[in-house]
């Protein structure tokens, strides 16, 4: 089901077919027989009513008020009411740009790092029945893709891939032919310059600790946005009930990159705890790092090298 | 380039199920721990469930008991079983690699939790 319109403040280009769906559409539909009333307000006019009747390109439908197409003297406020329910939207109609494919002040920005995941999905779900074809052009020139329902670009970004990508459906509705156009502006930048990302503090630490009690081990990084720390072990045997993730803090560093801490706590420790491998990874498409925890008893403490322990 | 495409995702009420796939391009894909992560708005990305080239499945405390992570090496995908889903649970998820370098993010898959 299509989501309802929740944006208050709605730009539209003048000759496409447009809609607003009001937000209590679950609620109209177990209220059959509640009156609904959709109006319009501009200028000097106050809350007309609006019904089939106003205009020909106008339809109503349940939760939808249909506008086939959308014109320049649409510019106004609309209001659906129910009982006590009522939504308000202020709607801008703009004109269509005759000397291209798509109009400037409707264009949606994007901007994506080369080598990154690039993708365009033509997708159009209110009009999706209607919808007789779909084309996908790249600064107004036509591509020629497969799939004509919903064309789809899915890359790895170059920066040739720059430019404004339109994607048109046609579709038709009482015997008249129109379309709905949705443009990206697609900027190609530099591989935005990542750390490979590092743990803090020992690659090997030995924990003190005495069976029963609890203990929590630290893990702390320097990481880019997208990277990811976790812990891993007990690879052979599953999951131990006694042991959590806790949930993972990070802090903005002044140059933009991230520390991040990321803490296991094991209670009730037991002998199936000891002398095994926590190991805490920070990860990155550019490369890993790994320290590992040993938790060792108390009393076997004596055989550990003072330079290898941790408390 | 590895290509990660996730798929799956879609619109649910809380307790309903849905299974999440994941396909890789990469030939020697069965030597890999592979892993589901997850990112809510305005959080970090989680690994939420992982599973060994062994087929040992791992899963983070919140899944647990109700998410079930598998993996088929012939078709170089990995799915995600998720039932009982909860309010919580509502992310874009992404399957990679754990353990190693990540390849490179897919786009992901939305999954929205919602009464």
């Known amino acids: 089901a299509e989501s309802c319109t929740s944006r208050p403040h709605i730009t539209v280009v003048e000759g496409e077919p447009f809609y607003l769906k009001h937000c209590s559409c679950s609620l109209a539909h177990e209220i059959e027989t509640t009156t609904k009333s959709w109006y319009k307000s501009s200028g000097s006019q106050e809350h007309v009513e609006l019904n089939p009747r106003s205009s020909s390109r106008i339809a109503l439908h349940d939760c939808v008020l249909e506008f086939w197409p959308v014109e320049l003297n649409d510019t106004g406020s609309y209001f659906f009411q129910m009982k006590n329910y009522t939504q308000k939207w202020k709607l801008n109609v703009i004109r269509r740009n005759k000397h291209s494919c798509f109009t400037e002040r409707q264009v949606t920005s994007k901007i994506v790092e080369v080598k990154k995941f690039f993708q365009i999905t033509c997708e159009n779900s209110y009009y999706q029945t209607l919808v007789n074809s779909t084309s996908l052009y790249k600064n107004c020139k036509k591509l020629l893709l497969e799939n004509n329902k919903n064309p789809t670009i899915k890359k790895n970004a170059e920066f040739e891939d720059q430019g404004y990508y339109s994607c048109v459906h046609f579709l038709h509705h009482n015997g008249k032919l129109f379309n709905i156009t949705k443009t990206f502006n697609i900027t190609i930048v530099e591989d935005r310059s990542n750390i490979v990302p590092v743990l803090l503090g020992p690659k090997l630490n030995h924990v003190a600790v005495e069976l029963g009690k609890n203990v929590r081990l630290n893990c702390s990084a320097l990481l880019n946005e997208e990277d990811v720390i976790y812990w891993m072990f007990g690879e052979e045997n599953g999951s131990d009930p006694n042991i959590h993730e806790e949930k993972e803090m990070r802090i903005m560093t002044p140059e933009g990159k991230w520390h991040a801490s990321k803490v296991l706590r094991i209670e009730n420790i037991g002998e199936s705890n000891l002398n095994v491998l926590y190991n805490c990874t920070v990860a990155s498409t550019g490369g890993t790092d790994t320290k590992s925890f040993i938790l060792v008893r108390k009393a076997d403490m004596a055989d550990i090298p003072g330079h290898v322990f941790t408390r | 380039d590895v290509q990660l495409q996730e798929s799956g995702g879609g619109l649910v009420q809380p307790g309903e199920s849905l299974r999440l796939s994941c396909t890789a391009s990469r030939s020697d894909f069965s030597r890999y721990t592979m892993g589901w992560y997850r990112q809510a708005p305005g959080k970090w990305r989680e690994l939420v469930a992982r599973?060994?080239?062994?087929?040992?499945?791992h899963y983070a405390d919140s899944v647990k008991g109700r998410f079930t992570i598998s993996r088929d090496n012939a078709k170089n995908t990995v799915t995600l079983q998720m039932n009982t889903l909860q309010f919580e649970d509502s992310a874009v998820y992404y399957c990679?690699?754990?353990?190693?370098?990540?390849?490179?993010w897919g786009q992901g898959t939305l999954v929205t939790v919602s009464s």
């Open positions: 599973i060994t080239s062994g087929g040992i499945p």
């Open positions: 990679n690699t754990v353990g190693v370098a990540l390849w490179a």
